[in-house]
C-alpha cells in the first residue's frame, strides 16, 4: 500500500465525535498530549483536528485492480506538528510529535460504512481500527466486514470552513 503523492489531495479542519455524539478532545498534560472521549457541556467548544487526505495505491497483486485500486488514507493532527499514531503493540492510539515524511503509523485507511460516519483503519495493521474503549481511543480488531458497522469504531466529522491550524 503506497501513498501515490507526497501532498494531500485535500485537507480541512473538523471536530471528531463518536457515533454516540461524545467528543474527542486533546489535553496537554506533563508535556505530552492525552486523548479523551467525553460529553461536552452545552456551549463548550469542540477541539478541531486537521484531516489530510492522501491517495494510496492498493497493491494490485492483492486486489486484481491493477492501477484502479485506489484508497484514501488520512492523517489526523489536532495541533501543529502532532499526529495521531497507531501503537499496534499496545493496541493504543497516541499523539506524537513527528516531522514529515510521517511514519506509516500516522496513516489510516478511510472507510465509511454509513453515509454520515467514518472509520479509520491502521495502515500498519490491516483489520485494526481506531475505536472507543473505556472513554479512550484504542485500536480494535475487526474480524469481518459485517462488524465494520460496529458503533465503537464509527466517528462523525463536523466540518468547518477554516483551513488554518491552531
Amino acid at each position: 500500500m503506497s501513498i501515490t503523492g507526497i501532498s494531500p489531495i485535500t485537507e480541512y479542519l473538523a471536530s471528531l465525535s463518536t457515533y454516540n455524539d461524545q467528543s474527542i478532545t486533546f489535553a496537554l498534560e506533563d508535556e505530552s498530549y492525552e486523548i479523551y472521549v467525553e460529553d461536552l457541556k452545552k456551549d463548550e467548544k469542540k477541539d478541531k483536528v486537521l484531516l489530510s487526505y492522501y491517495e494510496s495505491q492498493h497493491p494490485s497483486n492483492e486486489s486484481g485492480d491493477g492501477v484502479d485500486g485506489k484508497m484514501l488514507m488520512v492523517t489526523l493532527s489536532p495541533t501543529k506538528d502532532f499526529w495521531l499514531h497507531a501503537n499496534n503493540k499496545e493496541h493504543s492510539v497516541e499523539l506524537h510529535k513527528s516531522e514529515k515524511p510521517l511514519p506509516d503509523q500516522a496513516f489510516f485507511v478511510l472507510h465509511n460504512m454509513h453515509s454520515n460516519s467514518v472509520s479509520f483503519e491502521s495502515k500498519t495493521d490491516p483489520g485494526v481500527f481506531i475505536g472507543v474503549k473505556d472513554n479512550h481511543l484504542a485500536l480494535i480488531k475487526v474480524d469481518s466486514s459485517e462488524n465494520l458497522s460496529t458503533e465503537n469504531i464509527l466517528f462523525k466529522l463536523s466540518e468547518t470552513h477554516h483551513h488554518h491550524h491552531h
Epitope: I9, T10, Y12, Y53, E55, H58, S63, G64, D65, D68, G69, K70, M71, L72, V109, L110, H111, N112, M113, H114, S115, N116, S145, E146, L148, S149, E159, H161
Partner: antibody, heavy 121, light 106 residues
Framework: EVQLVESGGGLVQPGGSLRLSCAAS????????MYWVRQAPGKGLEWVAS????????YYPDSVKGRFTISRDNAKNSLYLQMNSLRAEDTAVYYC??????????????WGQGTLVTVSS | DIQMTQSPSSLSASVGDRVTITCKAS??????LDWYQQKPGKAPKLLIY???NLQTGVPSRFSGSGSGTDFTLTISSLQPEDFATYYC????????FGGGTKVEIK
C-alpha cells in the same frame, strides 16, 4: 479493466415492476460503494440509490424511497435495482456506477453505458 | 437535502475561449464536490474530484476551485472535444447533482 454492464431495461406499464442488473468485472467488487443514477430523456442526472460494500446500508432520494430497492451479491459481482410501482416519470436511462475509492462513498469513478427503462401504457 | 444550483444552464463559446461554470451548494459541503462531463448518448465521465483534483487522463486545461458553498469549473482554452454537458455533484451529505451546463459551439 473496470467494466460495468447494465441489463434488464425495457417497456413496462405504470404500476408495474422491473429489476435491473449490473454485472461488474475488473475490480474487487466487494470493496466498493455502488450506485444507480438515472437520466430522463433530455434531462439532467439524478442519483437514485447507493449501497455500502458489505450491503449493510442503502440510501435513496425521496423520489424513489419505498418503491426502489438496491441490493448486491458480492459473490456474483452483481448489483441490482428492484423497481416497483413504476410511474411515467421513472422513464430514464439507468446507469450503474462504482465509487472512485475502496471503502468510501466519495466520487463516481466508473460508469456503465446505461439501460433504458420506459414506463408507458 | 442539499441543493446544487449550477449556472449557466447553457453557454455558447468558441474554440480557444476560456469557459467558467459555477455551482452553488445550499449548505457547506467543504470540498466534497466533483465535476462530470457527458457527451450525447454516452455515460458521464469523472473529470475532477474533491473540488480540484484531475482524474487520470483529463487534460490540464480543466481545473476546479472552491470550498464551502461556491465552486467553479474552468476550461482554460476550449477544445473541439470539450463541447458537452457538465455536471457538478456533491457527496458531503447524501448525493446530489447540479442541473447541468451545456457547452455549445458559438
Amino acid at each position: 479493466e473496470v467494466q460495468l454492464v447494465e441489463s434488464g431495461g425495457g417497456l413496462v406499464q405504470p404500476g408495474g415492476s422491473l429489476r435491473l442488473s449490473c454485472a461488474a468485472s475488473g475490480f474487487t467488487f466487494s470493496s466498493y460503494w455502488m450506485y444507480w443514477v438515472r437520466q430522463a430523456p433530455g434531462k439532467g442526472l439524478e442519483w437514485v440509490a447507493s449501497i455500502t460494500p458489505n450491503a449493510g446500508e442503502d440510501y435513496y432520494p425521496d423520489s424513489v424511497k419505498g418503491r426502489f430497492t438496491i441490493s448486491r451479491d458480492n459473490a456474483k459481482n452483481s448489483l441490482y435495482l428492484q423497481m416497483n410501482s413504476l410511474r411515467a416519470e421513472d422513464t430514464a436511462v439507468y446507469y450503474c456506477a462504482r465509487g472512485h475509492y475502496y471503502y468510501t462513498s466519495y466520487s463516481l469513478g466508473y460508469w456503465g453505458q446505461g439501460t433504458l427503462v420506459t414506463v408507458s401504457s | 437535502d442539499i441543493q446544487m444550483t449550477q449556472s449557466p444552464s447553457s453557454l455558447s463559446a468558441s474554440v480557444g475561449d476560456r469557459v467558467t461554470i459555477t455551482c452553488k451548494a445550499s449548505q457547506n459541503i467543504n470540498k466534497h464536490l466533483d465535476w462530470y462531463q457527458q457527451k450525447p448518448g454516452k455515460a458521464p465521465k469523472l473529470l475532477i474530484y474533491f473540488t480540484n483534483n484531475l482524474q487520470t487522463g483529463v487534460p490540464s486545461r480543466f481545473s476546479g476551485s472552491g470550498s464551502g458553498t461556491d465552486f467553479t469549473l474552468t476550461i482554460s482554452s476550449l477544445q473541439p472535444e470539450d463541447f458537452a454537458t457538465y455536471y457538478c455533484f456533491q457527496y458531503n451529505n447524501g448525493w446530489t447533482f447540479g442541473g447541468g451546463t451545456k457547452v455549445e459551439i458559438k
